[in-house]
């Protein structure tokens, strides 16, 4: 069964800046990745970025840079300032859609004990 992993990290240089990394562990080719915060996209979450392997990347504030790391993993950097900036207990979710297999999603947040710069 395919799985999705999510890592959330706070940047040491900017304490309110986050990096989210997500990956898909499965055999299907990825059609779309959706990154949201505040919960899954279908349950009140707000979309931060949508990544399509052919048609490009769309992102919304406070997302600063979304990119593909591999064919099955992505990373997203969030701005560290402003009213819409994330806090330490924010939940981030990644949903990977593969055709015709379907979609798989997982969520993660910064562990309470995390020090800046340490991988969650």
């Amino acid at each position: 069964t395919p799985e999705v992993w999510v890592q959330v990290r706070m940047e040491a240089t900017e304490l309110s800046s986050f990096t989210i990394r997500c990956g898909f562990l499965g055999s299907g080719s990825i059609s779309l990745v959706t990154v949201s915060w505040g919960g899954p996209n279908g349950a009140g979450g707000t979309t931060l970025a949508v990544l399509h392997p052919e048609r490009g990347i769309r992102q919304w504030a406070p997302a600063r840079q979304a990119r593909w790391e591999t064919q099955s993993s992505i990373s997203l950097i969030l701005e560290g300032s402003g009213a819409s900036s994330p806090c330490a207990n924010t939940t981030f979710c990644c949903k990977f859609a593969s055709f015709p297999e379907g979609s798989w999603e997982a969520c993660g947040s910064l562990p309470p004990s995390s020090d800046p710069g340490l991988s969650a």
């Epitope: 059609s31 349950a43 048609r55 379907g102």
Partner: antibody, heavy 120, light 107 residues
């Protein structure tokens, strides 16, 4: 304007074969996943087969596995369904449909359908 | 396989009325739910995708809502051209599955 035009339907005896075609125009065919959906007289909709844009993955309804084969020719902007060992219960209108990645794989455009009648 | 159950099978209503159609999934389908309209002799037509987003050219009287397993399609004021069969569909997990449809007929 997006257009999908099916052809190849007709009357065939049980055990016979048909090849359905779907000619696509008005969009970059090679970038979209495609499906065949059927509707028996007076009944609901049933996904018969699907193929992804890069022809890596396919799906078949259990009752047609081993009898039907989906294929596509991206150079000819065409989708096909080879139907062998046809049964009376395969009688239906067959639609080809396009899936939109950005719409959660919803089928945003459909052909007008082609009627397949399997009867002795 | 995820089963999509629509209710009721048939509704008899008058133009101008408000109607809510129900669709229940046998397990969570996230937000990967679409609604289609089909008139006799025609192909299905996409109305709503991702639960609540109207497709291009779909009038504002059509709206979708729900999450997880329970979804609804609402038509705020029925027009004569809205009398048709409506299908919900999930595209969360293969195989994509449709509800059995709800037929809206004129009272």
């Amino acid at each position: 304007e997006v257009q999908l035009v099916e052809s190849g339907g007709g009357l065939v005896k049980p055990g016979g074969s048909l090849r359905l075609s779907c000619a696509a125009s008005g969009f970059t065919f090679s970038s979209y996943h495609m499906s065949w959906v059927r509707q028996a007289p007076g009944k609901g909709l049933e996904l018969v087969s699907a193929i992804n844009s890069n022809v890596i993955s396919t799906y078949y309804l259990d009752t047609v596995k081993g009898r039907f084969t989906i294929s596509r020719d991206n150079a000819k902007n065409s989708l096909y369904l080879q139907m062998n060992s046809l049964r009376a219960e395969d009688t239906a209108v067959y639609y080809c449909a396009r899936h939109e990645d950005y719409y959660g794989f919803a089928m945003d455009y459909w052909g007008q359908g082609t009627l397949v009648t399997v009867s002795s | 396989e995820i089963v999509m159950t629509q209710s009721p099978p048939t509704l008899s209503l008058s133009p101008g009325e408000r109607v809510t159609l129900s669709c229940k999934a046998s397990q969570s389908v996230s937000n990967d739910v679409a609604w289609y309209q089909q008139k006799p002799g025609q192909a299905p037509r996409l109305l709503i995708y991702y639960v609540s987003n109207r497709f291009t050219g779909i009038p504002a009287r059509f709206s979708g809502s729900g999450s997880g397993t329970d979804f609804t399609l609402t038509i705020s004021s029925l027009q004569p051209e809205d009398f048709a069969v409506y299908f919900c569909q999930q595209a969360y997990r293969s195989p994509w599955t449709f509800g059995q449809g709800t037929k809206l007929e004129i009272k």
